[in-house]
Interface confidence: low
């Protein structure tokens, strides 16, 4: 048995006569043979669940659920109750109604076996019938909503009449009906005004019914109509077995280049028309078991369960359902020499499913783990400027498919044939397992005899000792020209284009910094800045060469503070900036400020503000005023 609502409302007036019927509570059956029996909790409660007094005023008919006044609530009783309400005015009291058999201890009141009946308390006598508005004659102040369990026997779940009105104002005629689409499973009996279900409901066909209750009031010659929403929610039970969408119970996958722990190898989706068990219970009650295979398989794979609520269309309305994604995941990094094929089975069990049939599915994963061979092209040929600065990136080496690798460790080394011309270094990029070639020794670069540099590139997977080799020929081009005096170590220091382009800086392949002109669109990823090479800096990512020295690309790598309009990078650098961004790596600071070029938006007030802030104010105040300036520009 369960209540069709978790709360009921009615009004109570001082000196309402004993015997006044108040309202009906309704219970619906879980099984055809059940017979409801109602009992009231012993106490009346007030504000903040304060226990006010033993309930001496309201009784219930155990078989019908009718609540009525056993004795009139007079003014002195009302004052006694008010005095116990923690000093709050007594506006609402409530009673608990239980469905027997339940424990006789009056504890928490939880649906489905308990409902609360709230009484709005009026410190006046019942109003004259003629003064009641149609709305007050028809419906309680609080709109009811109903909960009906699916697949349960049909039954009565509401009674429209406001019983005190009917009892005290017999001359007013009130009629009710339900507006509903054809064929809906609800009926309002014209005589008793009881609303009942015609048949058991199926939540998987329809979950919510947004009906409208229509009340027609006849008082003398006048007739008025009042309409209120009458929502019914169908509650779910686990009556649907899990199924495979599109009948797909098998997934095939190849593990080749993605061999990293936590890689999702394959996914199978299971659909369940139910939304129970609820999310808190779901993973415990909806189990997935990787069926025993060999030890290698058990150690290498795990199954992850990812449930998600979805909605599906059923007969023109949307109902909630659940999709369960079962992901086969690598439990560890796989060696590149690993080579095997296996079939894995996963048993999925909807343990709450109550038949017919079993709530069990078998998922099949066919997995091939292929070995990975390391191959390099037979040779590489590159050129480098004699003016290149240290840490200038001049190219990449990459074993075949290295961009697709994850969980595969490849280390690159350069072996130089001429000891005095060992100009380049190589570092392995964590992102794509490539090797980035960079200038490591600028002195060697300037030696006339080092016009051609010969290297052997060796790529090694240390776990298996597998190797690949390739020749690398580097041609050194151009003349060395000494740099202007007073140029900073980092290109990023320069705030204007002319000073940027006349200097070099760490990481510059040409020996000159490059200016990147931004798009001027507020706080943008494409901010103006000075860079050693716009191919690599800034690109929102601090690469493995740039990590060698903070002066190369602080725009991507700085962990310090950024002043002005910006969005910080994750985990470091400037993701987006306002105007021009320049940096002082030693001070671990970057500044993003409006472009210096005259902006039509920058009116007299703006220029004055800037003048004051630059000439007259101290450091901290200067930043504040420039912030204001940013806002001025921005708006």
């Amino acid at each position: 048995l369960y209540f069709s609502r978790d709360a009921y409302w009615e009004k109570l007036y001082v000196d309402q006569p004993a015997g006044t019927p108040l309202l009906y509570v309704h219970a619906l059956r879980d099984a055809p043979e059940e017979v409801p029996s109602f009992r009231l909790g012993q106490h009346l409660y007030g504000t903040y669940r304060t226990r006010l007094h033993e309930n001496n005023w309201i009784c219930i008919q155990e078989d019908t659920g009718l609540l009525y006044l056993n004795r009139s609530l007079d003014r002195s009783s009302w004052e006694k109750l008010s005095g116990r309400n923690r000093g709050f005015p007594l506006l609402t009291v409530y009673l608990k109604v239980f469905l027997s058999p339940t424990s006789l201890r009056e504890g928490e009141c939880q649906w489905p076996g308990c409902a609360r009946v709230y009484f709005s308390f009026f410190n006046t006598s019942f109003p004259a019938c003629t003064s009641l508005k149609p709305r007050e004659l028809c419906f309680p102040e609080t709109r009811p909503s109903f909960r009906i369990r699916e697949n349960r026997p049909p039954g009565t779940f509401h009674q429209f009449r406001l019983l005190p009105v009917q009892f005290l104002c017999p001359n007013i005629s009130v009629a009710y009906r339900l507006l509903e689409g054809e064929g809906l499973p609800f009926r309002c009996a014209p005589d008793s005004l009881e609303v009942s279900t015609r048949w058991a409901l199926d939540r998987e066909q329809r979950e919510k019914y947004e009906l409208v209750a229509v009340c027609t009031v006849h008082a003398g010659a006048r007739e008025e109509v009042v309409m209120v929403p009458f929502p019914v929610t169908v509650y779910d039970e686990d009556d649907s077995a899990p199924t495979f969408p599109a009948g797909v119970d098998t997934a095939s996958a190849v593990v080749e280049f993605k061999r990293k722990e936590d890689t999702v190898v394959a996914t199978l989706r299971v659909f369940d028309a139910d939304v129970v068990p609820a999310s808190g219970e779901l993973v415990r009650r909806y189990t997935s078991t990787l069926l025993p295979g060999d030890t290698w398989t058990q150690q290498t794979f795990r199954v992850e369960h990812w449930p998600n609520e979805t909605s599906v269309q059923a007969n023109g309305s949307f109902v909630r359902a659940t999709v369960h994604d079962y992901r086969l995941v690598l439990n560890r990094n796989l060696s590149i020499s690993e080579n095997r094929t296996m079939q894995l089975a996963v048993l999925v069990n909807d343990s709450d499913f109550q038949g017919p049939g079993a709530g069990v599915l078998l998922l099949h994963f066919n997995v091939s783990v292929l070995p990975v061979s390391l191959h390099l092209p037979s040779s590489y040929s590159l050129s480098v400027s004699r003016r290149a600065r240290r840490f200038a990136q001049i190219g990449k080496v990459c074993v075949e498919n290295c961009q697709a690798f994850s969980g595969i460790n490849v280390q690159y080394e350069l072996h130089s044939s001429g000891a005095n011309c060992s100009t380049l270094g190589v570092v392995t990029s964590a992102e794509d397992t490539s090797g980035i070639l960079f200038v490591n020794d600028t002195k060697a670069l300037r030696r006339p005899k080092c016009a051609e540099l010969h290297y052997m590139v060796v790529a090694t997977n240390h776990q298996t000792s597998r190797q690949a080799q390739a020749q690398l020929l580097v041609t050194v081009e151009g003349l060395y020209v000494a740099e202007e005096a007073g140029c900073p170590l980092s290109c990023a220091v320069s705030k204007r284009r002319p000073e940027c382009e006349e200097c070099g800086g760490l990481g510059s392949p040409t020996g000159r910094c490059e200016w990147r002109q931004g798009d001027g669109k507020g706080i943008t990823r494409n901010f103006s800045t000075c860079s050693p090479s716009t191919k690599t800096c800034p690109d929102g990512h601090c690469d493995v060469v740039e990590t060698q020295d903070i002066n190369i690309c602080p725009q991507d790598c700085l962990r310090g503070s950024i002043v002005g309009g910006h969005e910080p990078g994750e985990p470091r650098g400037i993701k987006a900036g306002y105007g021009t961004c320049n940096c002082f790596p030693e001070e671990e600071k970057c500044f993003c400020e409006p472009e210096d070029i005259q902006d039509p938006l920058c009116d007299e007030l703006c220029r004055e503000q800037k003048l004051i802030s630059e000439e007259d104010l101290g450091g901290e105040q200067k930043l504040i005023s420039e912030e204001d300036l940013h806002h001025h520009h921005h708006h």
Epitope: E204, S240, G247, P356, G357, A358
Partner: antibody
Framework: QVQLVESGGGVGQPGRSLRLSCVAS????????MHWVRQAPGKGLDWVAI????????YNVDSVKGRFTISRDNSKNTLYLQMNSLGAEDTAIYYC?????????????WGQGTLVTVSS | DIQMTQSPPSLSASVGDRVTITCRAS??????LNWYQQKPGKAPKILIY???RLQSGVPSRFSGSGSGTDFTLTISSLQPEDFATYYC?????????FGGGTKVEIK
């Protein structure tokens, strides 16, 4: 309301090809798995092929594997069946059917069917 | 592949009769069984899904039961519009397979 309309049937010669189409309306096509089911004259129903809602899962019954290809264009709300190397045993009414969103692989809506006759 | 065997292949009955059609699967399929009705010249129409659940809009005189390998479709009181061919179908695994059909004719 939900509608499935097949076309492309007709007389095909043995060894030749035909392409069937099924235009869907009245529901969000991209959310539903779709099937082809056929029925030889005076005979029972035979499932032919299935395609997942996003086009990613394609399965054909063994008797048509390597000859028939199921595909879909979600932007055009259209399901296709490309039939190559036709044989007399492929003569049938071909129905496209929508998979029920509630019950898994149950066909809740069917087209009216298109007749394919393979004859020299 | 899972074979579905329907019996009887045909039956004659009168209006008001109770009619029972059975379907047997070659292996256990839980409750993954559907029943369809097909009238001459028309596409099939779903009646029962998940072995026993009535599709919305289908009259309540149709009912389904069974689980595992043996299933039954029952028409409690045959109506004139019920004369048709009935097919069972398993949705347990691909390839999906139908029973051979049961033709219900007027006696």
């Amino acid at each position: 309301q939900v509608q499935l309309v097949e076309s492309g049937g007709g007389v095909g010669q043995p060894g030749r090809s035909l392409r069937l189409s099924c235009v869907a309306s009245g529901f969000t096509f991209r959310n539903y798995g779709m099937h082809w089911v056929r029925q030889a004259p005076g005979k029972g129903l035979d499932w032919v092929a299935i395609i997942g809602y996003d086009g990613s899962k394609e399965y054909n019954v063994d008797s048509v594997k390597g000859r028939f290809t199921i595909s879909r264009d979600n932007s055009k709300n259209t399901l296709y069946l490309q039939m190559n190397s036709l044989g007399a045993e492929d003569t049938a009414i071909y129905y496209c059917a929508r998979e029920s969103p509630i019950t898994g692989t149950t066909f809740d809506y069917w087209g009216q069917g298109t007749l394919v006759t393979v004859s020299s | 592949d899972i074979q579905m065997t329907q019996s009887p292949p045909s039956l004659s009955a009168s209006v008001g009769d109770r009619v029972t059609i059975t379907c047997r699967a070659s292996q256990s399929i839980g409750n993954y069984l559907n029943w369809y009705q097909q009238k001459p010249g028309k596409a099939p129409k779903i009646l029962i899904y998940a072995a026993s659940r009535l599709q919305s809009g289908v009259p309540s005189r149709f009912s389904g039961s069974g689980s595992g390998t043996d299933f039954t479709l029952t028409i409690s009181s045959l109506q004139p519009e019920d004369f048709a061919t009935y097919y069972c179908q398993q949705s347990y695994s691909t390839p999906l397979t139908f029973g051979g059909g049961t033709k219900v004719e007027i006696k």
